[in-house]
C-alpha cells in the first residue's frame, strides 16, 4: 500500500505548498523570517526550523536583508541576483521590505507596558500591539528590530531558540484573554516522536512560538490602502484581536461567566451561554467562575495548579484526547469532531457540514486509531471527560434537529466548549 | 437511490493504457471517500485504490500490485470518479468496480457500481 | 498487510438450515470488518460492517459476531436467494483486504 503523495499538500497560512518545497515562514508582524526555514513534509504536515548559522571568519561580517546568516563581503552574492521586493508607504514616509519600525495612535487603548511594533512586508504594512516584558534597570535602550526598550545586555527574545530548535504553530493563537484555552498542554502532535509540528490546516495568521508568547501578546492588525485602523475590538481596557472570545467584566458584577464575547473585525458581539437541560450525574454542582454547572468527580490528586494529574485525569476522571477540523469552501463549513477512546480503541468523529447557518448534514463515524492516523488536518484541541462527551453528544442531538430548520451561527461552536476542562478554582472540582 | 455506472472497459494490450469512468448519483458526492475494486474471473475481491474527499486534501491510496501504474482522480463538480490505468499487465484482467465508502473515512464499501471488464490481452 | 482467512471455502446447504462463516484476521482488528454477499453475474452487496451493524434492508436473518482476530457470519433459516459467494473485509486500515471467500451452495 502506498500514499500517492501527487495530490498531498500542505496548508501554511492559507497557502498551499507542495510536499518538499521550501520556503521562508511569514510571521506576522515581522513580515518574512529568513532565519526560519520550513518543508511541507510527505504526511502534510509542514516543519520548521530555525537556521544554524556557520561561524563566519573575517573581521566584518555583512548582514544581507534577505538572507539569514552574516556573510564575508568576499563571498556575496553579485549583484544581479538581488531579490526585488516591494517597499511601504505609512504615514509618509517609505520603509524597506523587512523594515521595522514603530507606529503611534493605532490603538486607542494601549496599556502603558505595550508598543505598537510593526514591519513592512511584501508592500504591506503589519502592526501588533506587543507586550513589553518588565525593565530592571534604570536607564533602558532602544533596539533596532522591536518596539520595546530593553536593558542593556539583555538580547531581544526575538526568534533566539536553542540551536536547530524546531517550533510549531499553536493550534490556537491563544492571546491572554481566549476563552478557548485548555489547562491540558496537549502533546506537540497526534505523531509520536519527538519534533513537534504544523499539522496540516487550519492555520491561524501570526504564527508566535511559545517563548515568543511569553514575552506577551501580539495582536495581528494588516494596514493596507482600503483600511488604516486596527481590527481589533476593546472591551473594559483590554485589546482583543478579530476572532477572539472573553467573558465581559461589568463593574457592578465583574466577570459574567455566562455571557461570551466576540471580536467581530472591530465590533463585539455577546450572547448569552445556554447551559444543559439535563447532565450525566443526579446532581451537578456550581462551581466558582464557571456559568455551566457540573458532574462532580472523584477526589484526585492534584497537580500544583492543574486539576490533571500525572495519569491525564481531570477532578478524578479519566481524560481523552479531543481533535478538530474545519474545512470551509464554497460558503459550505464541513467541521468535524473526533474523540480517541482506549476502551474500545477507537476513534468516534462527529461530522457537521453546514451552509449559510442551516445544518445540511450531520453524521458520526467510528473509525479505527489507524485509519485515524491517516487523516490530515485533525488538530489536538484538548482533552476532555467521559462525562462532558456525554453532555455535548446529548446537546449535539438537540441543535442537529434545531439547526436543520433555523440559522444558527455559532451553537456548534458554544457547544464544543463544553469539553474544555478548565482549570479548577480554589483547587476543588 | 444511489447510483454508480462505470464505463471505459475493455480489451487492451500488455503495457497499454486505459482509463476507467464512473458516473455517481444519488449522493453528495464531495463528501465520501471512493474507491475502485476488481475481481478477476472466477476469483476473490482486490482493494486498488482509494481517493479521500477534498477536506482530506484528495489523498490517494493504491495496492501495492497496482502503485506507479494506476492513478485513482475525482471531478467533484461533474460526480464523477476515474481510474488511468498504465503499463497493464495480463493480471489485471478483471471486473472493475467502482464503490462509495460507507463514510468519510470508513473504509467498508457501501455501495457498489454494475462493474466494467478490463481484459489486459496480447 | 493484514491477512484474512476465510473458511470453509466453500459450503453446502439446504434451505431453511443454519450455517457459519468463519473469518480469521492475522492482528487484531478489534469490531473493524465487513461481511459482503456476492450472487453470480452481480455486485457486491454490503451485509454488516463493524462486526455485527446489519447494513440498510439486509434481512435479519444474518448475523455477525466477533472481535480482535475471529469472527463469524451466521444465517439462520436459509432462503433461496441467499445462495452465492460470501466475502469478509477488514477496514481497520489501509489497504483494506479481503477473504478469498466462501461459496455456499445449494444441497
Known amino acids: 500500500e502506498q500514499v500517492k503523495h501527487s495530490e498531498t499538500y500542505c496548508m501554511f497560512q492559507d497557502k498551499k505548498y507542495r510536499v518538499g518545497e521550501r520556503w521562508h515562514p511569514y510571521l506576522e508582524p515581522y513580515g518574512l523570517v529568513y532565519c526560519v526555514n520550513c518543508i511541507c513534509s510527505e504526511n502534510g504536515n509542514v516543519l520548521c526550523s530555525r537556521v544554524r548559522c556557520p561561524n563566519v571568519h573575517c573581521l566584518s561580517p555583512v548582514h544581507i536583508p534577505h538572507l539569514c546568516c552574516p556573510r564575508c563581503p568576499d563571498s556575496l552574492p553579485p549583484v544581479n541576483n538581488k531579490v526585488t521586493s516591494k517597499s511601504c508607504e505609512y504615514n509618509g514616509t517609505t520603509y524597506q521590505h523587512g523594515e521595522l519600525f514603530v507606529a503611534e495612535g493605532l490603538f486607542q487603548n494601549r496599556q502603558p507596558n505595550q508598543c505598537t511594533q510593526c514591519s513592512c512586508s511584501e508592500g504591506n504594512v503589519y502592526c501588533g500591539l506587543k507586550t513589553c516584558p518588565k525593565l530592571t534597570c534604570a536607564f533602558p535602550v532602544s533596539v533596532p528590530d522591536s518596539c520595546c526598550r530593553v536593558c542593556r545586555g539583555d538580547g531581544e527574545l526575538s526568534w533566539e531558540h536553542s540551536d536547530g530548535d524546531i517550533f510549531r504553530q499553536p493550534a490556537n493563537r491563544e492571546a491572554r484573554h481566549s476563552y478557548h484555552r485548555s489547562h491540558y498542554d496537549p502533546p506537540p502532535s497526534r505523531q509520536a516522536g519527538g519534533l513537534s509540528r504544523f499539522p496540516g490546516a487550519r492555520s491561524h495568521r501570526g504564527a508566535l512560538m511559545d517563548s515568543q508568547q511569553a514575552s506577551g501578546t501580539i495582536v495581528q492588525i494588516v494596514i493596507n490602502n482600503k483600511h488604516k485602523h486596527g481590527q481589533v475590538c476593546v472591551s473594559n481596557g483590554k485589546t482583543y484581536s478579530h476572532g477572539e472570545s472573553w467573558h465581559p467584566n461589568l463593574r457592578a458584577f465583574g466577570i459574567v461567566e455566562c455571557v461570551l464575547c466576540t471580536c467581530n473585525v472591530t465590533k463585539q458581539e455577546c450572547k448569552k451561554i445556554h447551559c444543559p437541560n439535563r447532565y450525566p450525574c443526579k446532581y451537578p454542582q456550581k462551581i466558582d467562575g464557571k456559568c455551566c454547572k457540573v458532574c462532580p468527580g472523584k477526589k484526585a490528586k492534584e497537580l500544583p495548579g492543574q486539576s490533571f494529574d500525572n495519569k491525564g485525569y481531570f477532578c478524578g476522571e479519566e481524560t481523552m484526547p479531543v481533535y478538530e477540523s474545519v474545512f470551509m469552501e464554497d460558503g459550505e463549513t464541513t467541521r468535524k469532531i473526533a474523540l480517541e477512546t482506549e476502551r474500545p480503541p477507537q476513534v468516534e468523529v462527529h461530522v457537521w457540514t453546514i451552509r449559510k447557518g442551516i445544518l445540511q448534514h450531520f453524521h458520526i463515524e467510528k473509525i479505527s486509531k489507524r485509519m485515524f492516523e491517516e487523516l490530515p488536518h485533525f488538530k489536538l484541541v484538548t482533552r476532555t471527560t467521559l462525562s462532558q462527551w456525554k453532555i455535548f453528544t446529548e446537546g449535539e442531538a438537540q441543535i442537529s434537529q434545531m439547526c436543520s430548520s433555523r440559522v444558527c451561527r455559532t451553537e456548534l461552536e458554544d457547544l464544543v466548549k463544553v469539553l474544555y476542562l478548565e482549570r479548577s478554582e480554589k483547587g476543588h472540582c | 437511490e444511489v447510483q454508480l455506472v462505470e464505463s471505459g472497459g475493455g480489451l487492451v494490450q500488455p503495457k497499454g493504457s486505459l482509463k476507467l469512468s464512473c458516473a455517481a448519483s444519488g449522493f453528495t458526492f464531495n463528501t465520501y471517500a471512493m474507491h475502485w475494486v476488481r475481481q478477476a474471473p472466477g476469483k476473490g475481491l482486490e482493494w486498488v485504490a482509494r481517493?479521500?474527499?477534498?477536506?482530506?486534501?484528495?489523498?490517494?491510496y493504491y495496492a501495492d500490485s497496482v502503485k506507479d501504474r494506476f492513478t485513482i482522480s475525482r471531478d467533484d463538480s461533474q460526480s464523477m470518479l476515474y481510474l488511468q490505468m498504465n503499463n497493464l499487465k495480463t493480471e489485471d484482467t478483471a471486473m472493475y468496480y467502482c464503490?462509495?465508502?460507507?463514510?468519510?473515512?470508513?473504509?467498508?464499501?457501501?455501495?457498489w457500481g454494475q462493474g466494467t471488464l478490463v481484459t489486459v490481452s496480447a | 498487510d493484514i491477512q484474512m482467512t476465510q473458511s470453509p471455502a466453500s459450503l453446502s446447504a439446504s434451505v431453511g438450515e443454519t450455517v457459519t462463516i468463519t473469518c480469521r484476521a492475522s492482528e487484531n482488528i478489534y469490531s473493524y470488518l465487513a461481511w459482503y454477499q456476492q450472487k453470480q453475474g452481480k455486485s457486491p452487496q454490503l451485509l454488516v460492517y463493524?462486526?455485527?451493524t446489519l447494513a440498510e434492508g439486509v434481512p435479519s436473518r444474518f448475523s455477525g459476531s466477533g472481535s480482535g482476530t475471529q469472527f463469524s457470519l451466521k444465517i439462520n433459516s436459509l432462503q433461496p436467494e441467499d445462495f452465492g459467494s460470501y466475502y469478509c473485509q477488514h477496514h481497520y486500515g489501509t489497504p483494506p483486504t479481503f477473504g478469498a471467500g466462501t461459496k455456499l451452495e445449494l444441497k
Open positions: 481517493i479521500r474527499s477534498k477536506s482530506s486534501n484528495y489523498a490517494t
Open positions: 463493524h462486526a455485527k
Open positions: 464503490v462509495r465508502d460507507g463514510g468519510y473515512y470508513e473504509a467498508w464499501f457501501a455501495y
